[in-house]
C-alpha cells in the first residue's frame, strides 16, 4: 500500500530488569524528512483528540532538544532512514508496546514494537541435534534472544558443572531481522557422556551467573561390556570347568543379542550372558570375548585369554639349518606344545643323553662331522614330562677328508713309461662327484679318480689331485721321481778363455743339465777313439795334431747320452814351409817357372815374403812366385817366409837352375 510508511525492525525484543535494549530500526517516510519523533509506552489512540495518549519515553522537537529526564532512552536514528533506539537501563515496567510516533511535514505514522522485560535474566535455550552418536561430532547450540551494546554478556558451556574443554564460537546479531547471542560448541561425544548434564550458562561481563539452560545428553552407543571369568586368572587344567560372565555396563539403546567369540570366531549355541565350559580340553585354550549388539551396532568386551594347562606333548626338533656345513653354527629347537611352557628339556644325540643341555634351544657354534645324526628331546613342565618325538636328522656336509694321490706303477718310473695314479680320500659328504689334477695335461682319465699319463716326461716332477663334492680338497703333491738318461750333454772349453794356441794348456769339460739317477760315468772320444773317462779332458801342451772333432758321453743306469761333436781348433804360426818348383828345379831359359811357398798354418798364412840367395826380399807377396820368361840369371837359391796372426815361419833354401836353351848355346 503506497499510503504506508515502511519500517523494518524485530517484532519483539527481550530483556530483563537492569539490562538494556538495543532496537535496530530502519524506516522510509512517505514524504520529506522527519520533523517530530515521540516514543510512547503502551500508546492508545484518543478519538476525541485524534491524538495518542500514553507515557512518553522520548520526545524530540523541531529544534532537536531532548529533556534531560529522557537520557535513559536514546533515539539513535536520523531524519530519513534510521530509527534505532536504545533503552539503558531497561526496567520491568518497560514491558509492553513501544510506539514510535513519526511526523513529517504532511504525514504521520505510529509504528509499534513489542518489548518483553522479565524480572530476572531469562535462560538461554540449548538446541541439540535429533540424534547423538558416540565419536560422531555434534554441534551444541545455545541461543539467547538478547544482545545489547551496553550490556556485555557471555555464554559458557559446562559438562556436569565443569567448564567444557572444547572451543566454542560465539556470535551476536543486532540487525533489523533478529537480535540474539549464540554460542556453538562442537565436540565428539563418547559413550561416557551419555546421561551427562550439559549446561549453557549466561554470565555477565564479570562471569557472574545470570541464568542457564540444561539438557541431558542422549548419546547412542554400542553396548559397553565387562567380562568376568572364574577362576579369575583364567588358568585351568584339562578337565576343569570355567565360567565366563558378560556384564553390560552401558547400552543405548537397549541391547538385542548376545554372542560369544573364541579367537574371533563365533561360538555356536552360546547366546546367554554366561558361558559355561565344562571339562575343558587344551583345544579350548584361546581368546574369549562376548559381543552384545544394539541398533547402533555390536560392542565387544575385552578378551580373556583362557589357558588350559597340560603336560608337554611329544616333542619335535627343528634344526636351523640342515644340512649344515662343517664349521658353521647350528641351532636345535625343541618344540613341544605345553601349558605352562616347559621349564626343563632333555636332549639326545643318536639316542644318548646330551649332558648339560636343559634349555629349549641347543646352540653348537662350530659344527663338526661327528655332530651328524639324530637329535631328539623331551620337554617337562609342572604337570609332567612329555614323550620323546621321532627326532630330526642333522646332516653335516664337509669337503672330502684325507685326500691322497697314489702312484700305482712299480718304482722307479722311467721316462717314457705309462704312469697310472689314483686319487683316494677317507670320507666325504656329499659324495665326491669329480676330481681335479695339477698340473693340467693332455692326460687320460680312464675312470673316476684315476689318471693315466702315457709316455711320461722326464720333467713330470709332481702331481696333485683334488677330490670334489660341493668343495674341492687337494692332496699334497706326490713326486713321480721319473728316472731318465743324462740330458743336455755338451762339451765346454774351460781353458784357455780365449782361442787355443799351440802349446797352450787346454781343459775341456763334459757338461749335462740333469740326470736321474745322479750317478754318472763320462767317456771322451775323438774320431772313434776313447780318450778318457773323467768329466774333464786335459792337454798340458796342445799341439796342432790334437785339433779335431771331440765328443763326450755321459751314462747312468737308465742310458747314455752323447754330446754333439765339438771341434777343437789349435792356432799356430806357419810351419813346415818349403818352396816347391814347377815344372821342376831345372828349367830352360825362356820358359816359365813357378815357385810355391807351401806351409802348414792355422790360421792360414795371410802374407808371404820371397827372398833370394842374397837374402834380398823380392817384390812378390803371394803364395806363388812366377818367373816368365825365366832367365839364366834367375838361377840361385830361394826361400819364403809365411806370416799369420800367430807368427812367422821360413822355409829352407831351394835352388832353381836355369839352363841355356839350345838356341842360346847355338849362338855361342
Amino acid at each position: 500500500d503506497s499510503s504506508k510508511w515502511v519500517f523494518e525492525h524485530p517484532e519483539t525484543l527481550y530483556a530483563w530488569e537492569g539490562a538494556c535494549v538495543w532496537i535496530p530500526c530502519t524506516y522510509r517516510a512517505l514524504d520529506g524528512d522527519l520533523e517530530s519523533f515521540i516514543l510512547f509506552h503502551n500508546p492508545e489512540y484518543n478519538k476525541n483528540t485524534s491524538k495518542f495518549d500514553g507515557t512518553r519515553l522520548y520526545e524530540s522537537t523541531k529544534d532537536g532538544k531532548v529533556p534531560s529526564e529522557q537520557k535513559r532512552v536514546q533515539f539513535l536514528g536520523d531524519k530519513n532512514k534510521n530509527c534505532t533506539l536504545s533503552i539503558h537501563p531497561v526496567h520491568l515496567n518497560d514491558s509492553g508496546q513501544l510506539g514510535l510516533r513519526m511526523e513529517s511535514k504532511t504525514e504521520k505514522w505510529m509504528e509499534r514494537i513489542h518489548l518483553n522485560v522479565s524480572e530476572r535474566p531469562f535462560p538461554p535455550h540449548i538446541q541439540l541435534p535429533p540424534e547423538i552418536q558416540e565419536s560422531q561430532e555434534v554441534t551444541l547450540t545455545c541461543l539467547l534472544n538478547f544482545s545489547c551494546y551496553g550490556y556485555p554478556i557471555q555464554l559458557q558451556w559446562l559438562l556436569e558443572g565443569v567448564p567444557m574443554r572444547q572451543a566454542a564460537v560465539t556470535s551476536t546479531s543486532l540487525t533489523i531481522k533478529s537480535v540474539f547471542t549464540r554460542s556453538e560448541l562442537k565436540f565428539s561425544p563418547q559413550w561416557s557422556h551419555h546421561g551427562k548434564i550439559v549446561t549453557c550458562q549466561l554470565q555477565d561481563a564479570d562471569g557472574k551467573f545470570l541464568s542457564n539452560d540444561t539438557v541431558q545428553l542422549n548419546v547412542k552407543h554400542t553396548p559397553k561390556l565387562e567380562i568376568k571369568v572364574t577362576p579369575s586368572d583364567a588358568i585351568v587344567r584339562e578337565g576343569d570347568s570355567v565360567t565366563m560372565t558378560c556384564e553390560v555396563s552401558s547400552s543405548n539403546p537397549e541391547y538385542t543379542t548376545v554372542s560369544w567369540l573364541k579367537d574371533g570366531t563365533s561360538l555356536k549355541k552360546q547366546n546367554t550372558f554366561t558361558l559355561n565350559l565344562r571339562e575343558v580340553t587344551k583345544d579350548q585354550s584361546g581368546k574369549y570375548c562376548c559381543q552384545v549388539s544394539n541398533d547402533v551396532g555390536p560392542g565387544r568386551s575385552e578378551e580373556v585369554f583362557l589357558q588350559v594347562q597340560y603336560a608337554p606333548e611329544p616333542s619335535t626338533v627343528q634344526i636351523l639349518h640342515s644340512p649344515a656345513v662343517e664349521g658353521s653354527q647350528v641351532e636345535f629347537l625343541c618344540m613341544s606344545l605345553a601349558n605352562p611352557l616347559p621349564t626343563n628339556y632333555t636332549w639326545y644325540h643318536n639316542g644318548k643323553e646330551m649332558q648339560g643341555r636343559t634349555e629349549e634351544k641347543v646352540h653348537i657354534p662350530k659344527i663338526l662331522p661327528w655332530h651328524a645324526g639324530t637329535y631328539s628331546c623331551v620337554a617337562e613342565n609342572i604337570l609332567g614330562t612329555g614323550q620323546r618325538g621321532p627326532g630330526a636328522e642333522l646332516d653335516v656336509q664337509y669337503p672330502p677328508k684325507k685326500v691322497t694321490t697314489v702312484i700305482q706303477n712299480p718304482m722307479p718310473i722311467r721316462e717314457g713309461d705309462t704312469v697310472t695314479l689314483s686319487c683316494n680320500y677317507n670320507s666325504s659328504n656329499p659324495s665326491v662327484t669329480r676330481y681335479e689334477w695339477k698340473p693340467h695335461g693332455a692326460w687320460e682319465e680312464p675312470s673316476l679318480g684315476v689318471l693315466k699319463i702315457q709316455n711320461v716326461g722326464w720333467d713330470n716332477t709332481t702331481i696333485a689331485c683334488a677330490a670334489c663334492n660341493s668343495w674341492c680338497s687337494w692332496a699334497s703333491p706326490v713326486a713321480l721321481n721319473v728316472q731318465y738318461a743324462p740330458r743336455d750333454v755338451r762339451v765346454r772349453k774351460i781353458k784357455p778363455l780365449s782361442e787355443i794356441h799351440s802349446g797352450n794348456s787346454v781343459s775341456l769339460q763334459c757338461d749335462f743339465s740333469s740326470s736321474h739317477p745322479k750317478e754318472v760315468q763320462f767317456f771322451w772320444e775323438k774320431n772313434g777313439r776313447l780318450l778318457g773317462k773323467e768329466s774333464q779332458l786335459n792337454f798340458d801342451s796342445i799341439s796342432p795334431e790334437d785339433a779335431g772333432s771331440y765328443s763326450c758321453w755321459v751314462n747312468n743306469s737308465i742310458g747314455q747320452t752323447a754330446s754333439k761333436a765339438w771341434t777343437l781348433e789349435v792356432l799356430y804360426a806357419p810351419r813346415r814351409l818349403r818352396v816347391s818348383m814347377s815344372p821342376g828345379d831345372q828349367v830352360m831359359e825362356g820358359k816359365s817357372a813357378t815357385l810355391t811357398c807351401e806351409s802348414d798354418a792355422n790360421p792360414p798364412v795371410s802374407h808371404y815374403t820371397w827372398f833370394d840367395w842374397n837374402n834380398q826380399s823380392l817384390p812378390y807377396h803371394s803364395q806363388k812366385l812366377r818367373l816368365e820368361p825365366v832367365k839364366v840369371q834367375h838361377s840361385g837359391a830361394y826361400w819364403c817366409q809365411g806370416t799369420n796372426s800367430v807368427g812367422k815361419g821360413r822355409s829352407p833354401l831351394s835352388t832353381l837352375t836355369v839352363y841355356y836353351s839350345p838356341e842360346t848355346i847355338g849362338r855361342r
Epitope: 561430532e137 567448564p163 574443554r165 572444547q166 562442537k186
Partner: antibody, heavy 119, light 106 residues
Amino acid sequence: QVQLKESGPGLVAPSQSLSITCTVSGFSLSRYTVHWVRQPPGKGLEWLGMIWGGGSTDYNSALKSRLSISKDNSKSQVFLKMNSLQTDDTAMYYCARPHDFDAGGFAYWGQGTLVTVSA
Amino acid sequence: QIVLTQSPAILSTSPGEKVTMTCSASSRVNYMYWYQQKPGSSPRLLIYDTSNLASGVPVRFSGSGSGTSYSLTISRMEAEDAATYYCQQWTSYPLTFGAGTKLELK
C-alpha cells in the same frame, strides 16, 4: 604409539598453491581431530584449522578463504591445501593431535615441514 | 578472537632459581595450555587444563590461574629448561597462542 609426519614441497612460488600431507599412525582418524599449526621463522605459533573425526572442518577466519583441509581415513592421511601463497606464508607447518578426541591441548606433534615461498 | 599476551617476552635466570611467567587473555577462558619449544624442535605440551602436567613432564613445572590471568612456574630452573614457552587457549575459535616467553640461562 601415536605418530604424525608431515611431507611437503619445500619450495613454492608466490601466488601458487601449497599441498601438505600429514600421515598418522597409532590412532584412528575417524575418532580424533587433527589440527594444522604454522610457525614463521623466528616467530610464534598460529592455528590454521582442524578436521573432525567425522570429516567436518573449522578454519581460522583470517585464512578461511585460502584454506582447505581434507583426509583419507583408510590411508591415515590428512591434507592441507592453501592457495595464493605469498612470502609471509613462509613457515614451518605442523600437524598436531589433541590429548583427547577433540580437546585437551596438542599432546602430539609432527616434526614439521618447512615451506619457503620464493620466486 | 581471544588475544593472549605473554610476559615477559624474555626472561634471564640462573640454574636453581624459581621462574614465573604469565599469560593474560583479552576475555575469559576456561582453561590454559602451555608448550615448551626448543630451536629446531616441535612444540611439546607441558601443562593441560590449566594445571595438569602432561606425560613425562618434570614435577618442577606447574600451572595455575583462572578467568583472564594464568601463569607457568618452574620451581627450580635447570639448564635444559632454556627454551621458548607458549600459552594457548581452547575456549573460543580460532584457537590462539601467545607470542611466547623466551627463557634464557644467565
